[in-house]
């Protein structure tokens, strides 16, 4: 049994780090492998993560952690029974992938404006809470040529779009993702998309 692609891990900077790797051949990850992790810290214990399959030769493990601080460093050992396949380390603060924003809602009852709101995925006491900026993707299923990214660089998780910039009488979808500039993170996954119908019509005298 051999590791083809070494584990690569990202942290949500809250409570979970996700490690993915590829094996040399088809593997029943949960039955054959264990990923052991231990915080380099006084009296810390070794904890065990049971991986899941992620494709034929891929494995993924979700490491449960306490809150993350910048000093944290973990040792990682990938075992197949009594055989040590790989040994490494992981500093969560240097490999951050934020959680995806949630509760994306479209408000169309605001005159002339489409208002999108969503929730910050972190509690106020988390370091990332005040550091997230967002990208909102809006596209149309009726008009494949239409797809826009709106960068939200302010803290408030809202976006206002003039309804007049969207075609009337067709459906649109939106999704949002986040990143944290000062933590040099990757982008989060996209939130689930939400759909709305743009029924806005310009006033007669503006036509």
């Amino acid at each position: 049994m051999k590791v083809l692609q070494e584990p690569a891990c990202v942290s949500d900077y809250m409570s979970i780090s996700t490690c993915e790797w590829k094996m040399g051949g088809p593997t029943n990850c949960s039955a054959e492998l264990r990923l052991l992790y231990q915080l380099v810290f006084q009296s810390s214990e070794t904890h065990t993560c049971v991986p899941e399959n992620n494709g034929g030769v891929g494995c993924v493990c979700h490491l449960l952690m306490d809150d993350v601080v910048s000093m944290d460093n973990y040792t990682l050992d990938l075992w197949a029974g009594q055989q040590l396949l790989w040994k490494g380390s992981f500093k969560p603060s240097e490999h951050v992938k934020p959680r995806a924003p949630g509760n994306l809602t479209v408000h169309t009852n605001v005159s002339d404006t489409v208002l999108l709101t969503w929730s910050n995925p972190y509690p106020p006491d988390n370091y990332l809470y005040n550091d997230l900026t967002y990208a909102v993707n809006i596209w149309s299923e009726n008009d494949p040529a239409y797809s826009r990214i709106h960068n939200v660089t302010y803290l408030k998780p809202t976006l206002r779009i003039p309804a007049s910039t969207l075609k009337s009488g067709i459906s649109y979808r939106a999704r949002v993702r986040a990143w944290a500039q000062h933590y040099n993170t990757t982008w989060s996954e996209w939130s689930p998309s939400t759909k709305w119908y743009n029924s806005y019509r310009e006033p007669f005298e503006q036509r």
Epitope: L39, F41, Q42, S43, S44, E45, T46, H47, L64, M65, D66, D67, V69, S70, M71, D72
Partner: antibody, heavy 125, light 112 residues
């Protein structure tokens, strides 16, 4: 009531051995790291050894490394300190203390918040 | 290894007056924001040590609020706002960031 009770101290000749015990009660013993601290007559406090809740992680002061062995029996809620090759400078009151909660991924520290009454070890010929 | 240095080593105080003990470490004891791995202990004559302050500024259960801990990194202070007769004994700081744990030499607080 959270309590630690030491036993096993006594008079021993240089080169001899003693085994100290520390019985814990009133808390989930296996979840906490434990520590031994000693105090020579008229001197300050000196850390001796620590052990994590599972017993997998063990730490010693240089002054006792290779001579003392810390261990625990979580089924008996008891901490031990096996003292071999005793020297005159090991003469002290030995205290056990409840250390950090080590069952969490990052051990949670609340100080050495419970101490035993101490047991006296005298090494003399 | 981390070394802890306390001062003063002797502290005569009049009851009702404040008292302050300093402790300095040779390495930073700050692990994360607000968490300095330094404790303060009091050992009264003939007794086991008792925890006063943990993680730099957290009072242990049952400790009177006249005791407070402050400082960060390498410099720490234990303050007693109004000393009482029952506060006499030896005060020790201790670093608990990593083994070997290290205690200060101890400060003897006595009533004038």
């Amino acid at each position: 009531e959270v309590q630690l009770v030491e036993s096993g101290g006594g008079l021993e000749q240089p080169g001899g051995s003693l085994r100290l015990s520390c019985a814990g009660s009133g808390f989930t013993f296996r979840d906490f790291a434990m520590t031994w601290v000693r105090q020579a007559p008229g001197k300050g406090l000196e850390w001796v050894s620590s052990i994590s809740g599972s017993g997998d992680n063990i730490y010693y002061a240089d002054s006792v490394k290779g001579r003392f062995t810390i261990s625990r029996d979580n089924s008996k809620n008891t901490l031990y300190l096996q003292m071999n090759s005793l020297r005159a400078e090991d003469t002290a009151v030995y205290y056990c203390a409840k250390d950090r909660l080590s069952v969490t991924v990052r051990p949670r520290y609340y100080g050495l918040d419970v101490w035993g009454q101490g047991t006296t070890v005298t090494v003399s010929s | 290894d981390i070394v802890m240095t306390q001062s003063p080593l002797s502290l005569p105080v009049t009851p009702g007056e404040p008292a302050s003990i300093s402790c300095r470490s040779t390495q930073s004891l700050l692990y994360s924001i607000g968490k300095n791995y330094v404790d303060w202990y009091l050992q009264k004559s003939g007794q086991s040590p008792q925890l006063l302050i943990y993680l730099g500024n957290n009072r242990a259960t049952g400790v009177p609020d006249r005791f407070s801990g402050s400082g960060s990194g390498t410099d720490f202070t234990l303050k007693i706002s109004r000393v009482e007769a029952e506060d006499v004994g030896f005060y020790y700081c201790m670093q608990a960031l990593t083994t070997p744990y290290a205690f200060g030499q101890g400060t003897k607080l006595e009533i004038k």
